[in-house]
């Protein structure tokens, strides 16, 4: 009898077995398991934009496909030869035996083999198409790769030139700082000389006064003429004393009635009887270090120590950590009092902070915090605020809880970026947060759509740069 069987061997090839009389024939045909089936969803022109497939991986896959194609071709040739040889033998047997049903079986076998060959040919065509698609895709990816490389090279060149520019700028600024330091030393020396000269003058005046006092004592024992002289001399002495106290007061408003008193803040200056706005010298208790601060003796009862002011863009606020620590600018104009002084001051007693703001349309607003203090330098002068009231927004534009202070050379913010470099100025940046009163000063009509300006978000929004700001502190119980 005749039997025709199809099964799978262990290595995944299709096995065709033909039982013919006492002989059985086995045909092993290769399967394309390494290729996608023609029904699988595959887009030939899909190109991955940002990260192309690894080139080596694509080459390997291409080689595998080529090998499979080669195998198929070899198998087909073997199969063709085998069929021809077999057909000759079979035809002889058929002619010899002349058995009708045997002929039918062979025709069936031939038909099956031809069908199989056609199937293999179709699959080969599919493989060829896929190889072509894969090749096109690889070419596109390679092109994309080279474009991406060119783009990266250009970016690297741009960045290199940018770095060079920044280095040039940096060295220029360093030279400028050194020049300023030299100038500062010269100024300090001249101030010291002036001080020495004043001391000499004061001691001379004291000796003159002593002489006059002696003359007065002598004059009292003389006659009425001498008494008249004494009266004149007394007048002269009084004039001199008045002159002395006036000249001392003019030099420094903190000198009162000829004697030096030190004040820790403007509230103390106010309580001592100085109720005029102006620049006063402040000294912390148990310290010899002095700072010049502007005192507002009129607003809301007076006694306010101004710790920051912006009004015309005359002072650059893109400063270093050290400059923000000790203070900079002009106390009667734009200035920053200094983080170290404010930190020490606000840790000795409870202070309130008032922030006064002006926009370009003539409006004014304020934010008042009932408790304010700065941590020490070790804790990056972190800001602490409680109890917000005022007209410049119901939500605090200084992020809560308080952040560390950041400058262009000290990045203590909560952003991957460097807020101080990006938005300019030193501030208690979050990431980067809803305020920066030390940003770039933009003049009127340039003050909108500016991300790096003087910002107080909960009053004027993010892109509005303010006309003026004042930060002032005063003891809570004043």
């Amino acid at each position: 009898y005749n039997n025709f069987r199809k099964s799978m061997d262990s290595i995944g090839k299709k096995q065709y077995q033909v039982q013919h009389g006492s002989c059985s024939y086995t045909f092993l045909l290769p399967e394309m398991d390494n290729c996608r089936s023609s029904s699988s969803p595959y887009v030939s022109n899909a190109v991955q934009r940002d990260a192309p497939l690894e080139y080596d991986d694509s080459v390997q896959r291409l080689q595998v496909l080529e090998n499979i194609m080669e195998n198929n071709t070899q198998w087909l040739m073997k199969l063709e030869n085998y069929i021809q040889d077999n057909m000759k033998k079979e035809m002889v047997e058929i002619q010899q035996n002349a058995v009708q049903n045997q002929t039918a079986v062979m025709i069936e076998i031939g038909t099956n083999l031809l069908n199989q060959t056609a199937e293999q040919t179709r699959k080969l065509t599919d493989v060829e198409a896929q190889v072509l698609n894969q090749t096109t895709r690889l070419e596109l990816q390679l092109l994309e790769h080279s474009l991406s490389t060119n783009k990266l090279e250009k970016q690297i060149l741009d960045q290199t030139s940018e770095i060079n520019k920044l280095q040039d700028k940096n060295s220029f600024l360093e030279k400028k700082v050194l020049a300023m330091e030299d100038k500062h030393i010269i100024q300090l020396q001249s101030i010291k000389e002036e001080k020495d000269q004043l001391q000499v003058l004061v001691s001379k005046q004291n000796s003159i006064i002593e002489e006059l006092e002696k003359k007065i004592v002598t004059a009292t024992v003389n006659n009425s003429v001498l008494q008249k002289q004494q009266h004149d001399l007394m007048e002269t002495v009084n004039n001199l004393l008045t002159m002395m106290s006036t000249s001392n007061s003019a030099k420094d408003p903190t000198v009162a009635k000829g004697e030096q008193i030190s004040f820790r803040d403007c509230a103390e200056v106010f309580k001592s009887g100085h109720t005029t706005n102006g620049v006063y010298t402040l000294t912390l208790p148990n310290s010899t270090e002095e700072v010049k601060a502007y005192c507002d003796m009129e607003a809301g009862g007076g006694g306010w120590t101004i710790i920051q002011r912006r009004e015309d863009g005359s002072v650059d606020f893109q400063r270093t950590w050290k400059e923000y620590k000790v203070g900079f600018g002009n106390p009667s104009g734009e200035y920053w009092l200094g983080n170290e002084f404010v930190s020490q001051l606000t840790n000795q007693q409870r202070y309130v902070l008032k922030i006064h703001l002006k926009d370009w349309e003539g409006n004014e607003a304020y934010s008042l915090y009932e408790h304010f203090y700065l941590s020490s330098e070790e804790l990056n002068y972190r800001i602490h605020l409680k109890g917000l009231t005022g007209t410049a927004g119901k939500i605090s534009s200084i992020s809560q809880p308080g952040n560390d202070f950041s400058t262009k050379d000290a990045d203590n913010d909560k952003c991957i970026c460097k807020c101080s470099q990006m938005l300019t100025g030193g501030w208690w940046f979050d990431a980067c947060g809803p305020s920066n009163l030390n940003g770039m000063y933009y003049p009127q009509r340039q003050n909108t759509n500016k991300f790096n300006g003087i910002k107080w978000y909960y009053w004027k929004g993010s892109g509005y740069s303010l006309k003026g700001t004042t930060m002032m502190i005063r003891p809570a119980g004043f």
Epitope: M440, Y442, P443, Q444, R445, Q446, N449
Partner: antibody, heavy 120, light 106 residues
């Protein structure tokens, strides 16, 4: 026709003073910001100062702050630049320029300029 | 201060040819850039503002492009009256001009 005519330039010694004027016609001065721009001989342009429509806002370039003052008289349709403590580097042709409406420092009309020479 | 750098300093072009002038800002100025034309003995004249908008009465052969830090003024076909000095100016942060590009006849 919009027209601006500068006057008041001339030769002045270092440390001296001058007052430049700009007479505007063909438009309403009080509706515009106005500026002074200067150009040193053979050099580029430099913005010097500008002033708001009503005179309430004024800006000056750092190099002239404290020495030059911009002002205006809307009733007389005139713009002024008071210059004092003049230096050799202030030598230039001074132009008065009109700022484009609602645009900062964008100059749509210029005068023909007046030459200021600071020399001893 | 924002520094404006123009290139080239001098551009030699034949009449009818295209001229391309460049202007670079030391920091981003968005599109707040203007171009002016100045002829000898005359006051400057506004050509372009907002980086690409032509001022009133300016011919279509003048066109501007760019934003951020890189800007270009293109004169598509130079006429005899176009030979002059061209200045770029930023009005994003205060007001500064470039040093100028002289366009001369080749």
């Amino acid at each position: 026709e919009v027209q601006m005519v500068e006057s008041g330039g001339g030769l002045v010694q270092p440390g001296g003073s001058l007052r430049l004027s700009c007479a505007a016609s063909g438009f309403t001065l009080r509706s515009y910001w106005m500026s002074w721009v200067r150009q040193a001989p053979g050099k580029g342009l430099e913005w010097v100062a500008n002033i708001k429509e009503d005179g309430s806002e004024k800006y000056h370039v750092d190099s002239v702050k404290g020495r030059f003052t911009i002002s205006r008289d809307n009733a007389e349709n005139s713009l002024f630049l008071q210059m004092s403590s003049l230096r050799a580097e202030d030598t230039a042709v001074y132009y008065c320029a009109r700022d484009m409406e609602a645009s900062a420092g964008l100059f749509d009309y210029w005068g023909q300029g007046t030459l200021v020479t600071v020399s001893s | 201060e924002i520094v404006m750098t123009q290139s080239p300093a001098t551009l030699s072009v034949s009449p009818g040819e295209r001229a391309i002038l460049s202007c670079r800002a030391s920091q981003s100025i968005s599109s707040n850039l203007a171009w002016y034309q100045q002829k000898p003995g005359q006051a400057p004249r506004l050509l372009i503002y907002g980086a690409s908008t032509r001022a009133t009465g300016i011919p279509a052969r003048f066109s501007g492009s760019g934003s951020g830090t890189e800007f270009t003024l293109t004169i598509s076909s130079l006429q005899s009256e176009d030979f002059a000095v061209y200045y770029c100016q930023q009005y994003n942060y205060w007001w500064t001009f470039g040093q100028g590009t002289k366009v001369e006849i080749k």
